[in-house]
């Protein structure tokens, strides 16, 4: 009998992206940042 | 979250094709991995494997009915087809489609409820 | 083809017994992955068969603790240690290593 074929395929897990600015004063220009999952990564 | 449904044509004529179409949602057939089934059960009886079709199109089919069936999909209308010829009264059954678990862990995690096909001699 | 063997075919219990299924294949089922490519799935009358094991002893998500899968090789065991009635209804092992993939003839679990 021939092997069955098993990938390693991935599971996609659908997560939120939240890109935001944050303005911390005239001096100090802006923090751009990336939250995925509730999570600040950049 | 993950479904699947079969449809087909209830009743058919012996000698003719038998034509199922599997629709589902949840899951995309061109993800890497990816994989659907077709299975049937004669009522009262055990269950058969026929045939799969993976995520890039290569196919896998019960050697006993290959000559007899032909597996496809359309991954943009999220369908996949299953088509026998010839068929008879024995071909009378309960015809599911599964998806099968992502990756090495294998497993049909996923069934649709099942569609009667009834063979007319 | 792999044929699965399962005994008994018909395992009458009571509730809150513990049961115990064998399921035999013809030839080795170790992929050459290195996976054993053995599950367990429950059918329930009227309804679609439900995935329980997959690779010989891993519960799939939402199966209770009480349903334990185990075995090697050509050898294969589903063990269930308090029966419920929900549990009842037939069992089938399956082989998803070699080409056709292939089911057990099924256990129907049922009451004394």
């Known amino acids: 009998d021939a092997e069955f074929r098993h990938d390693s395929g991935y599971e996609v897990h659908h997560q939120k992206l939240v890109f935001f600015a944050e303005d911390v004063g005239s001096n100090k220009g802006a923090i751009i940042g990336l939250m995925v999952g509730g999570v600040v990564i950049a | 979250q993950v479904t699947l449904k079969e449809s087909g044509p209830g009743i058919l004529q012996s000698s003719q094709t038998l034509s199922l179409t599997c629709s589902f949602s949840g899951f995309s057939l061109s993800t890497s991995g990816m994989g659907v089934s077709w299975i049937r059960q004669p009522s009262g009886k055990g269950l058969e494997w026929l045939a799969h079709i993976y995520w890039d199109d290569d196919k896998r089919y019960n050697p006993s009915l290959k000559s007899r069936l032909t597996i496809s999909k359309d991954t943009s209308r999220n369908q996949v087809f299953l088509k026998i010829t010839s068929v008879d009264t024995a071909d009378t059954a309960t015809y599911y489609c599964a998806r099968r678990r992502n990756g090495y862990d294998g497993g049909f995690a996923y069934w649709g409820q099942g569609t009667l096909v009834t063979v007319s001699a | 083809d792999v044929l699965m063997t399962q005994t008994p075919l018909s395992l009458p219990v009571s509730l809150g017994d513990q049961a115990s299924i064998s399921c035999r294949s013809s030839q080795s089922i170790v992929h050459s992955n290195g996976n054993t490519y053995l599950e367990w799935y429950l059918q329930k009358p009227g309804q679609s068969p439900k995935l329980l094991i997959y690779?010989?002893?891993n519960r799939f998500s939402g199966v209770p603790d009480r349903f334990s899968g185990s075995g090697s090789g050509t050898d294969f065991t589903l063990k269930i240690s308090r029966v419920e009635a929900e549990d009842l209804g037939v069992y089938y092992c399956?082989?998803?290593?070699?080409?056709?993939?292939?089911f057990g003839a099924g256990t129907k679990l049922e009451l004394k």
């Open positions: 399956f082989q998803g290593s070699h080409v056709p993939l292939t």
């Open positions: 690779k010989v002893s």
